[in-house]
C-alpha cells in the first residue's frame, strides 16, 4: 500500500541533491585553500540533519546551526556585494572583481545556490515530489529558512562601504519583501557600516533616466538613513560596458559614465 504523501505547491527537491551538495563542497574546498580543512561529509551530514525527519513547515534557524558552524568562513567585511533580483550580473561581477564577495561566493551560499530541498516529518526520506512554497504553503520551510539565516549573517558581517546591485528593470527597484529588503537591510550593523552604495542596473540601451530618483530607491534611502548609515546611489546605464571596464579599467572608453 503506497504511503500517503503531503503534496506541496512548490517544486520538489532538486534531483541528485545529496550528490550535488557533496560535489559542490569538494569543488569549493579544492579551489579555496582557506577552506581545505572542511570535512565535506560532515558538511553534508549537518545539512541533511537540518531538515530530514522534520516537518518542512517547522524549520528554524537553530536547525541550521551545525551547518553554519562547519561553514564558518572569514569574508573581508569591506568587500561585500549584496544583490536583489539581479543575481547573474552580481555573480559575473565578482567572477571578474575577485576580491569582492556575494553570498554565493561563500561555501554556504555556493552549496545551496539554485537548489531546492525538503524532507518529511518522521521519515528519513527526501521529498523529490514537492516542497512548500513560501507564499502558498509556509514561510518556515527548509529553503527559505536557510537563505534567511545565511543572508542575515552575511549582512551582519559587512563593514565600511557595502554595495548592493539592484535591478532597474523591475517595477519595484527596491522591494521591501525581497531578501535584501526584509533581511539584509535590517541586519547591517551601523557601528561597522558607514555607507550603503546602491548600483541600479539599467535594462534598456536607450534608458538614460536617473533611476536613483525612483520612489523605491528613496524609500531605501530613508530606511538606511534611519539606521544611521549613509546612502549613495549610482546608475549603471550599460551593464555590459560596466563589466568590460571592470575587466579592463585602463580602456580609454572606461573614463566616461557607464
Amino acid at each position: 500500500v503506497p504511503r500517503w504523501r503531503q503534496q506541496w505547491s512548490g517544486p520538489g527537491t532538486t534531483k541528485r541533491f545529496p550528490e550535488t551538495v557533496l560535489a559542490r563542497c569538494v569543488k569549493y574546498t579544492e579551489i579555496h585553500p582557506e577552506m581545505r580543512h572542511v570535512d565535506c561529509q560532515s558538511v553534508w551530514d549537518a545539512f541533511k540533519g537540518a531538515f530530514i525527519s522534520k516537518h518542512p513547515c517547522n524549520i528554524t534557524e537553530e536547525d541550521y546551526q551545525p551547518l553554519m558552524k562547519l561553514g564558518t568562513q572569514t569574508v573581508p567585511c569591506n568587500k561585500i556585494l549584496l544583490w536583489s533580483r539581479i543575481k547573474d550580473l552580481a555573480h559575473q561581477f565578482t567572477q571578474v572583481q575577485r576580491d569582492m564577495f556575494t553570498l554565493e561566493d561563500t561555501l554556504l551560499g555556493y552549496l545551496a545556490d539554485d537548489l531546492t530541498w525538503c524532507g518529511e516529518f518522521n521519515t528519513s526520506k527526501i521529498n523529490y515530489q514537492s516542497c512548500p512554497d513560501w507564499r502558498k504553503d509556509c514561510s518556515n520551510n527548509p529553503v527559505s529558512v536557510f537563505w534567511k539565516t545565511v543572508s542575515r549573517r552575511f549582512a551582519e558581517a559587512a563593514c565600511d562601504v557595502v554595495h548592493v546591485m539592484l535591478n532597474g528593470s523591475r517595477s519595484k527597484i527596491f522591494d521591501k519583501n525581497s531578501t535584501f529588503g526584509s533581511v539584509e537591510v535590517h541586519n547591517l550593523q551601523p557601528e561597522k557600516v558607514q555607507t550603503l552604495e546602491a548600483w541600479v542596473i539599467h535594462g534598456g540601451r536607450e534608458d538614460s533616466r536617473d533611476l536613483c530618483q525612483d520612489p523605491t530607491i528613496k524609500e531605501l534611502e530613508s530606511i538606511i538613513s534611519k539606521r544611521n548609515i549613509q546612502f549613495s546611489c549610482k546608475n549603471i546605464y550599460r551593464p555590459d560596458k560596466f563589466l568590460q571596464c571592470v575587466k579592463n579599467p585602463e580602456d580609454s572608453s572606461c573614463t566616461s559614465e557607464i
Epitope: 564558518t72 568562513q73 551582519e156 558581517a157 557601528e191 561597522k192
Partner: nanobody, 116 residues
Framework: QVQLQESGGGLVQPGGSLRLSCGAT????????MGWYRQAPGKQRELVAE???????NYADSVKGRFTISRDNAKNTVYLQMNSLNPEDTAVYYC??????????WGQGTQVTVSS
C-alpha cells in the same frame, strides 16, 4: 575586531566549584556561537561546552551534569559554571566566539587548577 577577556579561574580543591566569565568587546556584531575550550599540558585543545545564539547547548561527555554554560546576549558574555571539579579538569580554559562570516575569535585563557 573582537577581543575576548576571560576571568574567574584559580585554584580550587577537588569537589569544589568555579564560575568562569568571558566578555566580548570591540566591534560587536551578533556573535553566533560562544563556547569554552580547554587545554591541559601536553594535550590538544578540546571543546568543553558551547552555546548558540538561540540558546542550544552542547557539552563534552566528560563534563555533562557537572558544568553549565549560559549566555547573556545583551552583554555579549558567556559563563561556565563548573561544579564537582576534579584534578582532570586542570587546564587553561579558553573562551571562543564565532560568527559564520567573520571567523573565530579566542581569548588569552584563564588557568584552572584542581588540587588538594
Amino acid at each position: 575586531q573582537v577581543q575576548l577577556q576571560e576571568s574567574g579561574g584559580g585554584l580550587v580543591q577537588p569537589g569544589g566549584s568555579l564560575r568562569l566569565s568571558c566578555g566580548a568587546t570591540g566591534i560587536i556584531f551578533s556573535i553566533n556561537d560562544m563556547g569554552w575550550y580547554r587545554q591541559a599540558p601536553g594535550k590538544q585543545r578540546e571543546l568543553v561546552a558551547e552555546i548558540t545564539r538561540g540558546g542550544s547547548t552542547n557539552y563534552a561527555d566528560s563534563v555533562k551534569g557537572r558544568f553549565t554554560i549560559s549566555r547573556d546576549n545583551a552583554k555579549n558574555t558567556v559563563y561556565l559554571q563548573m561544579n564537582s571539579l576534579n584534578p582532570e579538569d586542570t587546564a587553561v580554559y579558553y573562551c571562543n566566539a564565532a560568527h559564520t562570516f567573520s571567523g573565530s575569535f579566542w581569548g588569552q585563557g584563564t588557568q584552572v587548577t584542581v588540587s588538594s
